[in-house]
């Protein structure tokens, strides 16, 4: 068409997909009467009439725009609804009078792509591949026009680099006219890239300006051979017998090699393989002093049959041996002295403490306990505690019982027991002394003796309450080589006036405390005797 080259540049109208484009016919009054205008769409240089304006009234032409066009602004503006990517073209309005003039509008359509979806290569990448390998794929769906992709590694943009970095992008057009972009990042990675964070960024334009969307960050599995193997022990710090100890083999390769953990046999000096659990961890539970020694880890790279050895690691399981006390079973006369000596072995320096068993009172800090002017009350338990101050919880103890020679000592001298006639009494009597006494009763009945400890005895007597017994009472006598001693039990008949308010049973129970370091009791229990058979 002659003179077409002098046409002014079309007016640019930018709009997002799905919204309404307002196409304002920019003809001046001198160029044409806006009450008589034809609208055309231009696609591949072919004009198609899409809308007529006559006397200010609009009429759509049949075709793709038939349902989406309307007049606005007293006929000066054509509104195109539900814009699609296919609407990106030139629209022109042509005035008919006074002479044929036209005004061109370039419609630009935009659509932000969806969030980019990044997929890492699940198979991973070996470090010494000869050419770039696929690291990840980035997909940006439904954008218009085609967005630009930028790949990042650790926050820095990646550039194409021969034999090192290659970015391969392609796009497909959806039926909607929108574009889906796929970009594959290929790279040659090094061992240090095992923790590298990769992501892709889509850059796109909207009427409001330039925008971008970032994918999530991903790391790619990087495979590299093991160069170093080492052992790690948990817990860290001083170990003691009884602890749960884990020895694990670690390597700087990926995937980890096949491991074995060995301990050096101290006598043969051979490395003997230890049995590890399914995770390749050697668990010592409970740890014993025999677990101390030299451990090492061997790793095999089965791809090359290369075997690697860790530096040996010395493991020390600290211990305290059984505690020995001498003399082991001390016996002393009243008024004499005694020296108790405590011994133990340990992998560390030991501290000793002597405690009184009954009270937990600390008597001495050190391995030797000296006792002077021994009284009967000094008899009983003494505990030696051997502990390692630098390792809390590492200690062993040994109890020794001191016996003081002396005649029997009764738990009580005398006491009252409430009874009923014809009941079977269960009487008990306790005595202590060294040598341990024996107990006898002054009445007939069923007696049984029970040793409470090396110096203490408890005798129990079952006896029927008779009028004679009520009169005489019961005596128990304890005797040993050094003398004898007696306790008396007075029997008192129960009647309604002697029953206490809370006595709702026919059993009266009486307890007496007599010994300075033992508790003793005497009980009476009623048992009804069978009634005589009635004779007919």
């Amino acid at each position: 068409v002659p003179g077409e080259a002098e046409q002014p540049a079309p007016e640019l109208v930018e709009v997002e997909v799905g919204s309404t484009a307002l196409l304002k016919c920019g003809l001046s009054q001198s160029q044409g009467n806006l009450s008589h205008v034809d609208w055309f769409s231009v696609h591949k240089e072919k004009r198609t009439l899409i809308f007529r304006v006559r006397q200010g009234q609009g009429q759509s032409e049949p075709g793709e725009y038939e349902q989406r066009l309307s007049l606005q602004d007293r006929g000066a503006t054509l509104a195109l609804t539900q814009v699609t990517p296919q609407d990106e073209r030139i629209f022109l309005c042509q005035g008919k009078r006074p002479r044929s003039q036209e005004y061109r509008i370039q419609l630009r359509v935009y659509k932000a792509p969806e969030e980019p979806n990044i997929q890492v290569n699940p198979l991973g990448i070996p470090v010494n591949s000869k050419e770039p390998e696929e690291v990840a794929t980035c997909v940006g769906r439904n954008g218009y026009p085609i967005p630009q992709v930028i790949w990042y590694k650790n926050g820095r943009p990646l550039k194409e680099e021969k034999n090192r970095v290659h970015i391969q992008s392609s796009q497909t057009v959806e039926s909607s006219g929108l574009y889906t972009l796929q970009s594959i990042l290929k790279a040659q990675l090094v061992k240090e890239d095992k923790d590298a964070q990769f992501y892709c960024e889509l850059n796109y334009r909207l009427p409001s300006g330039n925008h971008m969307k970032e994918s999530r960050e991903v790391t790619v599995p990087v495979f590299y051979p093991t160069e170093k193997v080492w052992l790690e022990v948990e817990p860290v710090g001083m170990l003691k017998e009884g602890d749960r100890v884990e020895i694990r083999c670690l390597a700087d390769g990926n995937p980890p090699p096949h491991f074995s953990i060995s301990k050096q046999n101290p006598s043969t000096r051979e490395a003997e393989e230890e049995t590890t659990n399914d995770n390749g961890v050697l668990v010592l539970e409970p740890a014993r002093k025999e677990h101390s020694g030299r451990y090492e880890c061997q790793a095999w790279n089965l791809d090359t049959m290369i075997s690697l050895l860790s530096e040996p690691q010395e493991l020390l399981v600290n211990y305290v041996s059984d505690v020995r006390v001498s003399p082991a079973a001390p016996e002393r006369q009243e008024g004499s002295s005694l020296t108790l000596t405590c011994e133990a072995e340990s992998s560390q320096d030991l501290e000793f403490q002597w405690l009184r068993e009954e009270t937990d009172q600390v008597l001495e800090r050190g391995p030797v306990l000296q006792l002077h002017d021994l009284k009967r009350e000094a008899g009983g338990g003494y505990r030696c505690v051997a502990s390692v101050p630098s390792i809390p919880g590492l200690n062993r103890t040994q109890l020794v019982k001191l016996a003081i020679f002396g005649p029997p000592w009764m738990a009580f001298k005398e006491r009252k027991v409430w009874v009923k006639e014809n009941m079977v009494l269960n009487l008990s009597c306790e005595a202590s002394g060294h040598p341990r006494p024996t107990i006898s009763w002054n009445v007939n009945g069923t007696a049984s003796e029970q040793d409470q400890d090396p110096q203490r005895v408890l005798s129990t007597l079952n006896v029927l309450v008779t009028p004679e017994l009520l009169e005489t009472g019961v005596e128990c006598t304890a005797s040993n080589d050094l003398g004898k001693n007696t306790s008396i039990l007075f029997l008192e008949l129960v009647n309604l006036t002697t029953l206490t308010p809370d006595s709702n049973t026919t059993t009266g129970l009486s307890t007496s405390t007599a010994s300075p370091h033992t508790r003793a009791n005497s009980t009476s229990t009623e048992r009804k005797l069978p009634e005589p058979e009635s004779r007919g």
């Epitope: 495979f223 490395a271 393989e273 790279n301 090359t304 049959m305 075997s307 690697l308």
Partner: antibody, heavy 120, light 112 residues
């Protein structure tokens, strides 16, 4: 018959580079672990590098780590040793070797060797 | 690193005589689980490349004459040629593969 033929040796100045090649035939090259072993003028043998059958795993002793690179092209049945920052102590006869299918690292087959001399 | 020490460094033996070469490792090469030692022996005849003789300390490579035998365990190993033949003149090397790979310095066998 297993055949390993080394090439690429020669005289090179200290600090220089050299690339050795080993052409393999008579076996399925891509199935075997390959290594380079060198022999010094004093007749000492020293392992130099090992590569897995697929080429993804490589190993070196500390004496050459970071200076030598072993690689392979299974399509061409060829093993390579790229040597850089060469030192006089790298002077040796370099042998290309093939492992065997034992559960232990052995150099079952050896080439005839190629001589590398590092000297100014 | 594991150091391999061979002794003697050379020896001259009459044909038909027994030859014993020792190899000592700076640490045990025994894998206690499989009860095998990571030790191999190689032979290098004059002007030739080395050749594998024995692996696992005592297993002969196929084609190796039975006059060659390997023994020992842990740190001390021996290569024995029961009756020296003229074609056995060579340098013999031991090699460990317990931790990476190291060779002994070699033992030269000559005919007296």
């Amino acid at each position: 018959e297993v055949k390993l033929v080394e090439s690429g040796g020669g005289l090179v100045q200290p600090g220089g580079s050299l690339r050795l090649s080993c052409a393999a035939s008579g076996f399925t090259f891509s199935s075997y672990i390959m290594s380079w072993v060198r022999q010094t003028p004093e007749k000492r043998l020293e392992w130099v590098a090992t590569i897995s059958s697929g080429g993804s795993s490589t190993y070196y002793p500390d004496s050459v780590k970071g200076r030598f690179t072993i690689s392979r092209d299974n399509a061409k049945n060829t093993l390579y040793l790229q040597m850089s920052s060469l030192k006089s102590e790298d002077t040796a006869m370099y042998y290309c070797t093939r492992d065997d299918d034992y559960d232990v690292k052995v150099f079952a087959y050896w080439g005839q060797g190629t001589l590398v001399t590092v000297s100014s | 690193d594991i150091v391999m020490t061979q002794s003697p460094s050379s020896l001259a033996v009459s044909l038909g005589e027994r030859v014993t070469i020792n190899c000592k490792s700076s640490r045990s090469l025994l894998n206690s689980r499989i009860r095998k030692n990571y030790l191999a022996w190689y032979q290098q005849k004059p002007g030739q490349s080395p050749k594998l003789l024995i692996y696992w300390a005592s297993t002969r490579e196929s084609g190796v004459p039975d006059r060659f035998s390997g023994s020992g365990s842990g740190t001390d190993f021996t290569l024995t040629i029961s009756s020296l033949q003229a074609e056995d003149v060579a340098v013999y090397y031991c090699k460990q593969s317990y931790n990476l790979l190291t060779f002994g310095q070699g033992t030269k066998v000559e005919i007296k």
